[in-house]
Interface confidence: medium
Amino acid sequence: RGVFRRDAHKSEVAHRFKDLGEENFKALVLIAFAQYLQQCPFEDHVKLVNEVTEFAKTCVADESAENCDKSLHTLFGDKLCTVATLRETYGEMADCCAKQEPERNECFLQHKDDNPNLPRLVRPEVDVMCTAFHDNEETFLKKYLYEIARRHPYFYAPELLFFAKRYKAAFTECCQAADKAACLLPKLDELRDEGKASSAKQRLKCASLQKFGERAFKAWAVARLSQRFPKAEFAEVSKLVTDLTKVHTECCHGDLLECADDRADLAKYICENQDSISSKLKECCEKPLLEKSHCIAEVENDEMPADLPSLAADFVESKDVCKNYAEAKDVFLGMFLYEYARRHPDYSVVLLLRLAKTYETTLEKCCAAADPHECYAKVFDEFKPLVEEPQNLIKQNCELFEQLGEYKFQNALLVRYTKKVPQVSTPTLVEVSRNLGKVGSKCCKHPEAKRMPCAEDYLSVVLNQLCVLHEKTPVSDRVTKCCTESLVNRRPCFSALEVDETYVPKEFNAETFTFHADICTLSEKERQIKKQTALVELVKHKPKATKEQLKAVMDDFAAFVEKCCKADDKETCFAEEGKKLVAASQAALGL
């Protein structure tokens, strides 16, 4: 089946059950339900999934059976609306159940919570986990899907199946190892970090589709696929973009069965046509389905074809530029983006999209001018500052990162961003700045040619986290402006923000800077977060504090924690020395 072909199935639920198989069907329905009803207990979801699965089996046996002709949204929505505690647990989300499809599904989507009030996942002891895995492997793995899906309501469902497969493999291998912990813990850490990154990347795709529309997503996909598959024909890239857009539209819209099915079809198509797509796909295409799809999504860029002609001939020098543009604007701009991107694997996707936007704006203006060619002849000169801006920014920040190391680089960004948008909640500023700071270790090690696509496209993902968290509780007009005006200019918009002079400093609260002995038992990462939380609060109290003042206070704070954690009576030390530290900090900062 091609990704486009939608056969006339009497029963959509039977069709998807047969295509995906029972195991994947059940897993995807569980993910879908957990992403919609994020507060429901695990057991309730399992019960709903089993009911849906039994119903699907009756439809497989007889597609004409009662209700088998209903849409998946109708079937799933009806099932979700049977939850007895919907009103108490979810409040106004229960009003969705009074609506008809498709409004009901749209209503459920609007109530997805990017920051649900759920307890942090605490990892049990390795022996406890291994026992649970051996006692009931199926429940153990379902619980993993459930816990990830409810905390990440936009997680790319078919990719979560891939993570679950790796999660299972880790326990299968390590629970038999001599040193279970040494085997398992690094694997779980890796899955956790990769999972967070995967969730954030998918969240940007969904935001792109939902906030800026299909055209914005397609432009992103043309640029990225053209960089990845520079030998592929424009026709080929266009086909892949259309199919990929359909897959992500489905997943972002909660149509997880269709999404997973279409993603499998797309992987199959790519592998059947790899000769005309990329020479780098061979290894991916030999893998089983979930690994194959993941591998294709991460595949390295193919080599650029030799002797690509100058872009100027078709897009600046040709007498036909305005005619070509007028006859098929999006196709012509798509070709421009394709040709530019395949020649520039060294540019970020967002930079390529800025260049395409500049080119489009120039043609809009010039094709209405008296002498169009004269007007657009220098359009490529306008690209120079757009290219240099991220290049310079990355160079400066990588130098700073190399000088400071990750933790202190994160702190520099914490101060920078707190001064730009001090109204944003402290936990959000800490989370976002820590992630922004990770760009250093992630990208600065790369050679020049790989730095920009690594850094700027990663920053787009992180800033989208800020945007979706801020959207839930908007507190800053500046954040709203940068987040909503232009998807591709978000990073330059935030970079351009200066200190917010309108901000009224927060009242000093000694409680914010009171610490206890429990800090001594925290992991290094959690201790860093405590210190970084204090740093943000300091800046909110004293936004005009200099780097030197803040550094002095933070150094004193680090020494205070180290001293009291070594003390015999830790709690007394924290109480007494803490008061002295607060007083000294107030004096140092003039509070």
């Epitope: 592929a232 026709a235 036909d320 196709v331």
Partner: nanobody, 116 residues
Framework: AVQLVDSGGGLVQPGGSLRLSCAAS????????MSWVRQYPGKEPEWVSS????????RYADSVKGRFSISRDNAKNTLYLQMNSLKPEDTAEYYC?????????RTQGTQVTVSS
Amino acid sequence: AVQLVDSGGGLVQPGGSLRLSCAASGFSFGSFGMSWVRQYPGKEPEWVSSINGRGDDTRYADSVKGRFSISRDNAKNTLYLQMNSLKPEDTAEYYCTIGRSVSRSRTQGTQVTVSS
């Protein structure tokens, strides 16, 4: 979906002629420059000739200048390559592409063999 279908290849003696066609569909054909590309077994594709959207600007690789002629019929959404004075070294698979890309289209090319 965008599609390009090449035809017209075959076996011809040195000095002979062939006319290749490329039928295009799924996009605004007259809006785009088109090219012919050839590929020898195991080698990178090689650009042969290009024509702009209107059909009044043509370009050729030095190796085919004076022997090959590119043209198009926008009403029929078809691109042509008239090949005269063929030489054994013109033996290759030929295919058309959109723009000036030398990248391989998904469609089958058309094989040209020049041999006595």
